[in-house]
């Protein structure tokens, strides 16, 4: 059997079920792309000399195995012999020390089995009629879930609870609230109505104070970026206890403390002022830039330890908001202006490089042009975004650039620098006979396809060398193949491909000559 296929033979180890409590467990299987699947599991016990076999029984009753060796994760394609559209049962058999250990089975339809995430990011906690209410944003494209929670106090083990089915953009859970002890909660999710689907991992711990609050300790969350390009930094006062559950330890208990908030805007280093100190009670609005936030705490004896948080940049992109025109004199960007007399900071960096390599430029205060647009131009000599590669661009705006909390994000997007129309020309164009009157044309993806949202479409041009007739065929940016039909045998044709952006027409690839041979019947 090939390693990439599920082997429909008897497994290569004897039947010697150990019946032990250790062994493989927590098997999870799901689709990870359009045609690839992954199963992963945990193994409890000594791992030396253990061989894992992922077993699968199809709905037909035929069974097979993948040999995973010592790995506890295995990927396979939809061509591996496992039917992904029908229900299958999977489990792991681990062969070790002359005995077999089996995981519990999972029964599912692999194609519809999505890797569900636990609640991510900020989980909002509130009190409702003497109970605890947790609320969080449903992870992207994962509406429809069963949710479970587990909770523990410093003196009790984990107890499992059920949040019930969820079917909205936000999910919530009612949980028990303790009067005088702190609790640690974790949540997990799985696909709703999908028989046998796998549970997600447990979420990061959610630490909940007792109902009777002790002294507060500072904690932040950041709201999502609003339409105005700003997001609110919010403070949550989280009472702490000296005794905390295991996953909640490390939070220093406080006394009466006065706090100051120090903001450091990491993005757009070319602006005049990068830091600002505020009273903690007055929580600022921030742009979508990356920040470091420090809380400088003081009590009657003087300042205490600083607490520093990193707020990552908001990476939501708006591929349509930015127009770029490339001329002989240089390049100009246009975007919807924010207001009169705005200073803009344009920041760019090659995709995939460290944030420290970002370059930026600050404009003089400018008013919108007659079309309501703001602009930024640069010459070719400046070298800005001159290399033929993908850049990530963010534009910030402020009417008062000296005030750190008045910056807003205008947009974030991608741009292919340099001579994009030439750099993006598809290579390795090849033509293969498809039928008596058609050919299949395929090509290597354009460099532009590495830059999200930049490649608008491919265009394939076919020219009849006899009649000089030309036909053009638009092709989706995700495709690199097209079938040309209605061709005549014995006629010479040339084919070329170009890659277009929203603003630039690409350069045609080298002409590729071909013809379909005339079929001679006996």
């Amino acid at each position: 059997c090939r390693t990439s296929e599920c082997c429909f033979q008897d497994p290569p180890y004897p039947d010697a079920d150990s019946g032990s409590a250790s062994g493989p467990r927590d098997l999870r299987c799901y689709r990870i792309s359009s045609d690839r699947y992954e199963c992963s599991w945990q193994y409890e016990g000594p791992t030396a000399g253990v061989s894992h076999f992922l077993r699968c029984c199809l709905s037909s009753g035929r069974c097979c195995y993948f040999a995973a060796g010592s790995a506890t994760r295995l990927q396979f394609s939809d061509q591996a012999g496992v039917s992904v559209l029908y229900t299958v049962t999977l489990w792991v058999e681990s062969w070790a020390r002359n005995q077999t250990e089996k995981s519990p089975e999972v029964t599912l339809q692999l194609y519809n089995s999505v890797k569900y995430e636990p609640p991510l990011g900020d989980i909002k906690v509130s009190k409702l009629a003497g109970q605890l209410r947790m609320e969080w944003e449903t992870p992207d494209n994962q509406v429809g879930a069963e949710v479970q929670f587990r909770h523990r106090t410093p003196s009790s083990p984990w107890k499992l609870g059920d949040c019930g089915p969820q079917d909205d953009d936000t999910e919530s859970c009612l949980c028990p609230l303790e009067m005088n002890v702190a609790q640690e909660f974790q949540l997990r999710r799985r696909q709703l109505g999908s028989q046998g689907s796998s549970w997600s991992k447990w979420s990061s711990p959610v630490c909940v104070p007792p109902e009777n609050p002790p002294q507060p300790q500072v904690r932040f969350s950041v709201e999502q970026l609003g339409q105005d390009g700003r997001r609110r930094l919010t403070l949550k006062e989280q009472p702490t206890q000296l005794e905390l559950p295991e996953g909640c330890q490390g939070l220093a208990p406080g006394t009466e403390v006065t706090y100051r908030l120090q903001l450091h805007m990491l993005s757009c280093p070319c602006k005049a002022k990068a830091t600002r100190t505020l009273h903690l009670g007055k929580m600022p609005y921030l742009s979508g830039a990356a920040y470091n936030v420090a809380v400088i705490s003081s009590n009657q004896f003087g300042p205490g330890l600083n607490q520093t948080w990193h707020i990552p940049a908001d990476t939501h992109t708006e591929p349509v908001a930015l127009n770029i025109s490339v001329g002989t004199n240089g390049t100009t960007m246009y975007w919807p202006a924010r207001a009169q007399s705005m200073t803009y900071c344009i920041e760019w960096q090659p995709v995939g490089q460290d944030g420290g390599l970002a370059t930026c430029s600050l404009t003089a205060p400018q008013d919108p042009d007659p079309a309501g647009m703001a602009t930024y131009s640069w010459s070719r000599e400046s070298g800005a975004m001159g290399q033929e590669k993908c850049y990530y661009i963010t534009i910030f705006a402020s009417a008062h650039p000296e005030k750190l909390t008045l910056w807003s994000t205008v947009l974030s997007t991608y741009h292919f620098g340099g001579n994009a129309s030439a750099a993006g020309t598809p290579h390795h164009v090849s033509v293969k006979n498809h039928s008596l009157d058609s050919v299949s044309v395929d090509w290597a993806p354009s460099l532009l396809s590495t830059c999200p949202g930049v490649l608008k479409e491919y265009v394939v041009r076919c020219r009849d060398e006899d009649s000089k007739q030309v036909s053009e065929h638009p092709v989706q940016p995700t495709e690199t193949q097209v079938t040309l039909s209605g061709l005549r045998a014995g006629v010479a044709y040339t084919v070329q491909v170009r890659a277009d952006t929203a603003w630039l027409r690409g350069v045609w690839s080298q002409p590729q000559r071909f013809s379909i041979e005339v079929q001679v019947s006996d």
Epitope: C57, S59, R62, C63, C64, T89, P104, E105, V106, T107
Partner: nanobody, 125 residues
Framework: QVQLVESGGGLVQAGGSLRLSCAAS????????MGWFRQAPGQEREFVAA????????YYADSVKGRFTISRDNAKNTVYLQMNTLKPDDTAVYYC??????????????????WGQGTQVTVSS
């Protein structure tokens, strides 16, 4: 190994129903795939139905599909075969079987290492 004892067989008229039970003792019941086989006089033992360890996935011979239902109760260490719309052709000795490891096919009798003594089912016309 696991010990298996079938019950519930008997004489029934065509079109009637019977429910067979198979009680297991010994090793952990929930670690076995369970199956029912049958053998009519002068014929080979044939696969009837099987159920995976988690009780979700079930398999049936074409001849019984839609009429027989296999189920299991891991808490009671028991597997059941509900037989409806019985036909004279269903007359046979019915055996309960346990497989600690399945091979190439669920219906392959060689996968099943523990067998009960069998219970007679007779369907009269």
């Amino acid at each position: 190994q696991v010990q298996l004892v079938e019950s519930g067989g008997g004489l029934v008229q065509a079109g009637g129903s019977l429910r067979l039970s198979c009680a297991a003792s010994g090793r952990t019941f929930s670690s076995y795939v369970m199956g029912w086989f049958r053998q009519a006089p002068g014929q080979e033992r044939e696969f009837v139905a099987a159920i995976m360890r988690n009780g979700i996935m079930t398999y049936y011979a074409d001849s019984v599909k839609g009429r027989f239902t296999i189920s299991r109760d891991n808490a009671k260490n028991t597997v059941y075969l509900q037989m409806n719309t019985l036909k004279p052709d269903d007359t046979a000795v019915y055996y309960c079987a346990a497989a600690s490891r399945v091979g190439v096919s669920i219906s392959q009798s060689s996968s099943y290492t523990s067998w009960g003594q069998g219970t007679q089912v007779t369907v009269s016309s």
